[in-house]
Interface confidence: low
């Protein structure tokens, strides 16, 4: 019995299509492919950034894959043919590995790039970046801004940039539309007469960096003798109720109650008679139904009761 | 460790529905594959559906195209299998599996090597 051989993939690349991380990797059929007219031949690609412990892997019978990476670091990847059991009349059969690289040539010493480098989209409506100029760079120094997302079509450079002393320092983006629920890509690079910039690079996912408006309408109700309603209602905006987790902090008689974190608008206290002042404030956050991560509010406006008994009165701010 | 813990099974008529439910637990990447199998008496493990929690691309069976859905749930961790027109050649032990080294689900044909994470599995029973 002769042994089945089977060769690699011909042209392996990675292809860089200007969407600041998100590259193609692609290839041809491996050569002499005749004898398995009737297989279907399957690839074995494997790929990370350099450093990383861990290889991504996928099958397919495709040609090409898509992936986002991040671009501050070089990318390897390698791929090998797949000969199934079917077509081999017993054990599946791979082929050597074909390999190759990419990693855009760094511009700059590492401290030129900028530092700090901030994003917030507030109330899934807005979205703000910022960030610090890079270490020692000069004055004449200016950092530009470019996103991608998928649904455009190419690379956008920032039109509203918000600016320290005639440097830009931070971004205020547009309407981003179909924009969350999936990587969103920023390359910020710079250009000085003096010295070279070095390029930054940035991947998040525009629903875990939510910074929501603070709960309104902060109520009382007395429930019994012994227990009082705390209720407030969500923020205007487009974020839905059961998106939202709540943090309460309650003083009774200047002494911090209670701090708690609960998942609808309202929260039972117990207290005394004795109560001479109660105050409470709120603060809210996605929770983790609608993101993996998130930024807390600000606190509301203080509601306080003061004096009168609560027993038939219900507070409003 | 990953731990698997399947439910929904059971026993209904043919042309019912039932919903099958898999959480995962004791993992820690955001990039991996889950998937539903099954094995009927006598027969050998077949590939039902996957769903990649990264792209969410599915991929399905020609048996139960059109009539099962796989989705994921909001905690990303937890996989359902919707059956609906079930027939009484769905009978099986169906199992959940999953795969954290991978990001995309394979095609049908080859998923029996592509998961290294297995369920107990839970019984459906389609009969009058």
């Known amino acids: 019995d002769t042994e089945i051989k089977v060769n690699p993939p011909q042209d392996f690349e990675i292809v860089d299509p200007g969407y600041l991380g998100y590259l193609y990797l692609q290839w041809q059929p491996p050569l002499s492919l005749d004898h398995f007219k009737e297989c279907t031949v399957e690839y074995e690609l494997k790929y990370r950034n350099i450093g990383s412990e861990t290889w991504k892997t996928i099958i397919t019978k495709n040609l090409h894959y898509k992936d986002g990476f991040d671009l501050n670091k070089g990318i390897e990847a390698k791929i090998h043919t797949l000969l199934p059991w079917q077509c081999t009349n017993g054990s599946e059969v791979q082929s050597s590995w074909a390999e190759t690289t990419y990693w855009i040539s760094p511009q700059g010493i590492p401290e030129t790039k900028v530092q700090d480098m901030d994003c917030v989209y507030y109330n899934w409506q807005y979205l703000l970046c910022s960030w610090k100029p890079g270490i020692g760079v000069l004055l004449d120094t200016n950092y530009n801004l470019f996103y991608w997302y998928e649904g455009l079509d190419h690379a956008l450079q920032c039109v509203d940039y918000i600016k320290a002393d005639g440097q830009n320092i931070g971004c205020r983006f547009p309407y981003l539309e179909a924009s969350d629920y999936k990587d969103f890509y920023i390359c910020v690079n710079g250009s000085s007469e003096n010295k070279p910039i070095r390029s930054s690079y940035f991947t998040f996912q525009l629903q875990n960096i939510v910074k929501p408006l603070p709960p309104v309408y902060l109520t009382f109700t007395r429930e019994s003798s012994c227990e009082i309603k705390l209720k407030w209602s969500i923020p205007l905006g487009p974020i839905p109720a059961r998106c939202f987790d709540y943090e309460i902090e309650i003083r009774e008689d200047d002494t911090t109650l209670v701090t708690a974190t609960v998942e609808n608008e309202t929260y039972t206290l117990k207290t005394t008679n004795e109560t001479r002042q109660l105050c409470f404030v709120v603060r809210s956050k996605v929770n983790i139904y609608c993101s993996d991560d998130g930024i807390w509010s600000e606190w509301s406006d203080k509601q306080c009761w003061e004096g009168e008994d609560l027993s038939k009165k219900t507070l409003l701010r | 460790e990953v731990q698997l813990v399947e439910s929904g099974g059971g026993l209904v008529q043919p042309g019912g529905s039932l919903r099958l439910s898999c959480a995962a637990s004791g993992f820690a990447s955001d990039d991996y594959i889950m998937g539903w199998f099954r094995q009927a008496p006598g027969k050998g493990l077949e590939g039902v559906s996957c769903?990649?929690?990264?792209?969410?691309?599915?991929v399905y069976a020609d048996s139960v195209k059109g009539r099962f859905r796989i989705s994921r749930g909001n905690a990303k961790n937890t996989v359902y299998l919707q059956m609906s027109a079930l027939r009484p050649e769905d009978t099986a032990v169906y199992y959940c599996?999953?795969?954290?080294?991978?990001?995309?689900?394979?095609?049908?044909?080859?998923?029996?090597?592509?998961?290294?994470?297995w369920g107990q599995g839970t019984q459906v029973t389609v009969s009058s």
């Open positions: 769903i990649s929690s990264r792209y969410a691309n599915t």
């Open positions: 599996a999953m795969d954290s080294r991978r990001v995309t689900c394979p095609e049908i044909s080859t998923m029996h090597r592509n998961f290294d994470s």
